[in-house]
């Protein structure tokens, strides 16, 4: 043999019960002690420190705390130093050292010692991770190191959690004993925070001990709080709230179009949008995630705003007879009423649409002019003007004529055309043509699509001359012999060589 002692490094006992500390020791056989004596010390291995003597084989003298409460169960001669402590109280909790006394110089306090823990609650052992939906085993363990009093176990608050299975008395690694009862069940998320209890009672005594454990059930997030769709006026403040139930708390993330806007580990997360713009209109997603799963929900944000200034696209110049298509479009929320006016006359209108198509089949000169596209909703009105130019061959209007007065003849040639025509006056009897470029004789004035050219003739009175007015543009030429109004003497101006 060699010097050594074996005892549990720790051992537990319920207050008021007893505890048997199993202990054996060894020493070299050649020491051959005639008698083996021993001492149990409390809290210190050194007699110099005058530690309380728990038990001493040579004498009956023990510390008052252990008077009548300590007894050696083991036989020191058989190298068994097992100690029994009865009616244990909290002050007996601590370290217990055994000192072998073999005579001569061979007294030895073994460094191995036992720490006694006086408990008053059963130990409920819950696995480090309890996941909702996965079967779990919860055990209640109590020390069973008192040969005189044996504990009986029962569960408290386990209704609906399955029937307990009693494992009975089990030996632990270091020779201590425990009573164990098991509970198997599949926890739900609702079981999180549930208090599960275990009671140890000792038959034929009033001793009863209870312990409780709160279930920490892990479960994936479920989003439980979320705005329904939100409408907000441009420039206003918007708060989007997302709340989730999970354990542990989830990582909450607000996203839009794949971009993370805000995230935090929390049970709820507020997304604050200051002075919203139409650009922030859209679908916002809240993602809740923890190690056990995830959930996501979306909310639509509708930003309400007045229409933008309409834009007009299409042909702004057309040839008479062509079909003209003009598109007026805007952006607003809600969609606007779109109307196209010409000279206060409604030509086309749509309700709650963002674009309006105006179709003018076979345009005529009357279609030429200024148009307005007006967009309006409850938040405002915007308008855009545009001009449609209809091009056509000259038309000589009926008000074209010649009139004589004293010594002059004035001929008016009134032409409607687009683009502006060139005008020429022809006097066939004289084989003369006067162009509008000849400012001495011709004065032209345009008003809209109407060009008025005036030919002034001066000279002797004669028979009224024939005057033919010809108007010409890229679409064609029109001629008209100008009628005379009233028979007056004709004044004549010599034109030409």
């Amino acid at each position: 043999g060699h010097w050594g002692a074996w005892m549990p490094s720790s051992i537990s006992a319920f207050e008021g019960t007893c505890v048997s500390i199993p202990c054996r020791f060894d020493f070299p056989d050649e020491l051959r002690p005639a008698v083996v004596h021993g001492v149990w010390y409390f809290n210190s291995p050194y007699p110099k420190n005058y530690p309380p003597v728990v038990f001493k084989s040579r004498t009956q003298v023990v510390h008052e705390s252990f008077q009548g409460r300590s007894r050696l169960l083991g036989d020191l001669g058989l190298r068994n130093c097992t100690l029994l402590l009865s009616n244990v109280s909290p002050e007996l909790g601590g370290k217990y050292y055994f000192r072998g006394d073999l005579g001569g110089y061979n007294q030895y306090t073994f460094s191995e010692h036992s720490v006694l823990d006086i408990v008053n609650t059963p130990n409920i052992v819950v696995p480090p991770e309890v996941v909702a939906g996965t079967e779990v085993e919860v055990s209640c363990m109590v020390p069973d190191n008192c040969p005189e009093l044996r504990p009986e176990l029962s569960w408290l608050g386990h209704e609906g959690l399955g029937e307990p299975a009693v494992l009975g008395r089990l030996r632990e690694d270091e020779g201590t004993w425990v009573q164990v009862s098991l509970l198997h069940f599949v926890p739900t998320r609702e079981a999180n925070g549930h208090r599960l209890g275990c009671q140890a009672s000792f038959p034929n005594t009033t001793l009863q001990f209870e312990g409780y454990a709160s279930m920490d059930v892990k479960y994936p997030p479920v989003i439980v709080e979320m705005n329904s769709s939100v409408e907000a006026i441009e420039g206003s403040h918007v708060s989007l709230l997302c709340g989730a139930d999970s354990n542990p708390p989830p990582l909450l993330t607000w996203m839009r179009d794949g971009t993370v806007l805000r995230e935090a580990v929390a049970e709820s997360l507020l997304l604050e949008l200051e002075e919203v713009t139409p650009a922030e209109d859209g679908v916002y997603a809240c993602l809740a995630e923890n190690a056990y799963g995830q959930d996501n929900r979306t909310v639509g944000l509708s930003v309400m705003y007045a229409p933008w200034k309409p834009t007009v696209n299409g042909t702004m110049v057309a040839v008479e007879g062509e079909t003209v298509s003009i598109l007026c479009s805007t952006q607003s929320n809600p969609d606007p009423i779109l109307t196209i006016f010409k000279e206060k006359q409604i030509l086309s209108t749509v309700i709650y649409e963002s674009e309006l198509q105006l179709e003018l089949p076979a345009v005529s000169p009357e279609d030429d002019g200024e148009y307005w596209c007006v967009a309006e909703n409850q938040y405002g009105q915007r308008a855009t003007a545009f001009n449609l130019s209809v091009e056509f061959a000259p038309v000589l209007l009926l008000e074209s004529h010649c009139a004589a007065a004293r010594d002059t003849v004035q001929c008016l040639c009134v032409v409607k055309s687009n683009p502006e025509p060139s005008v020429a006056f022809e006097l066939p009897s004289r084989n003369v043509t006067v162009n509008e470029s000849e400012r001495e004789f011709v004065y032209s004035e345009r008003s809209g699509l109407v060009l008025t050219s005036i030919l002034t003739l001066r000279g002797q009175a004669q028979a009224p001359p024939r005057v033919i007015c010809t108007a010409r543009n890229l679409y064609g030429a029109k001629s008209l012999e100008l009628p005379f109004q009233g028979a007056h003497r004709l004044m004549w101006a010599k034109i030409g060589p």
Partner: antibody, heavy 126, light 112 residues
Framework: QVQLVQSGSELKKPGASNKVSCKAS????????MNWVRQAPGQGLEWMGW????????TYADDFTGRFVFSLDTSVSTAYLQISSLKAEDTATYFC???????????????????WGQGTLVTVSS | DIVMTQSPDSLAVSLGERATINCKSS????????????LAWYQQKPGQPPKLLIY???TRESGVPDRFSGSGSGTDFTLTISSLQAEDVAVYYC????????FGQGTKLEIK
């Protein structure tokens, strides 16, 4: 140098008590245990036991339990042997002798008594 | 307890001659853990305390003349004085300190 100086000879009546002192010097008192050895006139040596000067724990040989008490006063580096209820057969020279110790008190190193006091003769006679 | 028996009880040797004292233990004093013999020899002159000569069965204490030597193992041990001097006249004790300490009865050494 190491010295163990014992108290002087004593003549005692049967039933009386006697206390022999052993004052140590020249070394650290608590690093060495103190043994007590008895030698009756014309007889051999008998080991009575020892006291661990570090822990204060006495150990008595089987023949010397009861009337014999070992004690210490470490402040003056002195060990004491008290004999009560003296008997005629207690007449002897009592020696103190030191031996090295370790703090656990196990004699694994095989410490031996290396220095002895001069002895104290205790005579018990009526 | 381990009983130590010395022989002879007394011994007379001429000056300068070798003196041999034997000691037998009732049980081995060889400690298996360190393979050492827990045996010492003491010299005691009249009116004086014992003086340590040898420990570990063969290790000479400092200051002890080298004419003193110890030998043996287990249960049989010997103290040898190689050349006896007049000042060596004394009683010699063997002593085991493995278990509860015991001494031999002593051997008285005289000059022949």
């Amino acid at each position: 140098q190491v010295q163990l100086v014992q108290s002087g000879s004593e003549l005692k009546k049967p039933g009386a008590s006697n206390k022999v002192s052993c004052k140590a010097s020249g070394y650290t008192f608590t690093n060495y245990g103190m043994n007590w050895v008895r030698q009756a006139p014309g007889q051999g040596l008998e080991w009575m036991g020892w006291i661990n000067t570090y822990t204060g724990e006495p150990t008595y040989a089987d023949d010397f339990t009861g009337r014999f008490v070992f004690s210490l006063d470490t402040s003056v580096s002195t060990a004491y042997l008290q004999i009560s209820s003296l008997k005629a057969e207690d007449t002897a020279t009592y020696f103190c002798a030191r031996n090295p110790i370790n703090y656990y008190g196990i004699n694994y190193e095989g410490y031996v008594m290396d220095y002895w006091g001069q002895g104290t003769l205790v005579t018990v006679s009526s | 307890d381990i009983v130590m028996t010395q022989s002879p009880d007394s011994l007379a040797v001429s000056l300068g001659e070798r003196a041999t004292i034997n000691c037998k233990s009732s049980h081995s004093v060889l400690y298996s853990s360190n393979q050492k013999n827990y045996l010492a020899w003491y010299q005691q002159k009249p009116g004086q305390p014992p003086k340590l000569l040898i420990y570990w069965a063969s290790t000479r204490e400092s200051g002890v003349p080298d004419r003193f030597s110890g030998s043996g193992s287990g249960t049989d041990f010997t103290l040898t004085i190689s050349s006896l001097q007049a000042e060596d006249v004394a009683v010699y004790y063997c002593h085991q300190y493995l278990s509860s300490l015991t001494f031999g009865q002593g051997t008285k050494l005289e000059i022949k």
